[in-house]
Amino acid sequence: DAHKSEVAHRFKDLGEENFKALVLIAFAQYLQQCPFEDHVKLVNEVTEFAKTCVADESAENCDKSLHTLFGDKLCTVATLRETYGEMADCCAKQEPERNECFLQHKDDNPNLPRLVRPEVDVMCTAFHDNEETFLKKYLYEIARRHPYFYAPELLFFAKRYKAAFTECCQAADKAACLLPKLDELRDEGKASSAKQRLKCASLQKFGERAFKAWAVARLSQRFPKAEFAEVSKLVTDLTKVHTECCHGDLLECADDRADLAKYICENQDSISSKLKECCEKPLLEKSHCIAEVENDEMPADLPSLAADFVESKDVCKNYAEAKDVFLGMFLYEYARRHPDYSVVLLLRLAKTYETTLEKCCAAADPHECYAKVFDEFKPLVEEPQNLIKQNCELFEQLGEYKFQNALLVRYTKKVPQVSTPTLVEVSRNLGKVGSKCCKHPEAKRMPCAEDYLSVVLNQLCVLHEKTPVSDRVTKCCTESLVNRRPCFSALEVDETYVPKEFNAETFTFHADICTLSEKERQIKKQTALVELVKHKPKATKEQLKAVMDDFAAFVEKCCKADDKETCFAEEGKKLVAASQAALGL
């Protein structure tokens, strides 16, 4: 439905508080280097303008599109050329090219300082002194570091952030109350950001059809009692929401997400029996709850899939009449019967089915040709099952840290050209699959593990895309979204790699390592491990283990020494020499 003023429409729908928060997120996700104060100023100007349009929708410029209004506002930033370089060229373009240009310049790994958490008392004072500014700063800092963060969900995080400070700053032991909550928000936030990044990559790199297929599979698992037509409607609406958010249309996205939550709750009887609690919550909690809701129970007595998709004489006729719909029905029927499969596996099965129909329906005897199509699924199902079984056994044997190290070695050997920080970050996250998924029973392991790995490997893909260094990574990332994980799993040691020159500086450590948290210390050691493998890609597990054990002992010893710095200098030289000898460097 057309509105005379889009900005007034969204302001009225969302309310002033959400409107301002979403505009701040949008601006911070586009101009990631701009100071907080500059963004607040721009947001206030846009908000004042929106209010004039609410008062009179026919007022000057109120009929302009949101992209035009926001883009014009961003292009008033004085230091655009100095701060952002070629991004300033976007401002010479007209809409919609200008917005596309801004989107292309979003940086998944912006050069921003690490967020350091101040003392609890300092944070509580800041919170009490100016709650509004404190919360805006949170939105700004998260949005600029995560330019694809799902904006309506960030509002939910901000609400929880505020609740944590409201409660804990009054508590007797502020730190004991607040710090675990902030840790939880940080970890959940990183996970949420990574999940959304995959959705945006799916839409932007593989198109709407790929995203819709993912959504059909996931929603069919979640809502197995819903009819295909109902699932299709939800998929269409969900695709619109994510297309908007990934495209920077955050006001429309948040508005449409609210509408979708409303529709789901009004129609929960025909969607899922698990939605009741979610639908009693306020809007932000409700939307989050629906997105995370557990799978409903499968209907009893579902007929065999073979009847409609293999045995029916109408398979090719139905496929020819509406290919994507017929494949969608196949995916829906398969997914609702298999909550124990990962979404990516279901998509691989659907792709195999599609390829078979494309070949067989054009053949002389189609039925004879596709009669055994379900037999082709067996190896596709067994491959992730076996991989998960093996890796969970390894995880249970090693524990998380050493399991991460095994993956670090494995992935550094596969793609040694990738930067060390990226290899460490990605391998650490890959390693978290163990504690996240291996505790689950068999029926939940695959959807947990393989769909999580898809999210983590997408991080590798987006970071690598910024500065491509490996043809093998590019190939696995771009050829097929659903086959990324099997593609990386299948990579062997890169025999073409020329080992890195040995640099003693890389293995020089100082007393500051002693004051680091356990996590930071692990990262230091894992960074050294990656560098070792880059120097000696053919090093055996045993050799690497010996060097890493020596390294751990060296850190422990020097951190206990009276003169730590001297210990690190002297013992460090010995360690480097011993390691070189052990590895034959």
């Epitope: 037509a229 299709s232 409607k233 109408d314 090719c316 006729k317 139905n318 496929y319 020819a320 009449e321 509406a322 290919k323 719909v325 017929f326 029905m329 494309e358 329906c361 054009a362």
Partner: nanobody, 123 residues
């Protein structure tokens, strides 16, 4: 707005031939499967033939196999049905149709379709 306009019908003797055309507009013809269905006087709808978006997959009802040929020209947004060796039982109104989102595949009442063109086969 989806529009399907059939033409080419008429009266013909048994054993004769006709070529039906269907001009399509208002939707993505080149990515849509297309169907010919017919309705004989006093009877229900009967599926005749289906052609996929890229014309690689073609299906016919047993009653017309070997006599009718379905084809399409995606550049012209037009669907065809070449009917040879016509019989009295082929007398019907012929409709071209395409799947409409939200309807069941093969449930032709729910498809988009044209106003039809009458084919009469009589000696």
């Amino acid at each position: 707005e989806v529009q399907l306009v059939e033409s080419g019908g008429g009266e013909v003797q048994p054993g004769g031939s006709l070529r039906l055309s269907c001009a399509a507009s208002g939707f993505a013809f080149s990515t849509s499967g297309m169907v010919w269905v017919r309705q004989a006087p006093g009877k229900g709808l009967e599926w005749v033939s289906t052609i996929s978006d890229d014309a690689r997959i073609i299906r016919y009802a047993e009653s017309v196999k070997g006599r009718f040929t379905i084809s399409r020209d995606n550049a012209k947004n037009t669907l065809y049905l070449q009917m040879n060796s016509l019989r009295a039982e082929d007398t019907a109104v012929y409709y071209c149709a395409t799947y409409r989102a939200g309807s069941r595949i093969g449930s032709y009442e729910d498809y988009y379709w044209g106003q039809g063109t009458l084919v009469t086969v009589k000696p």
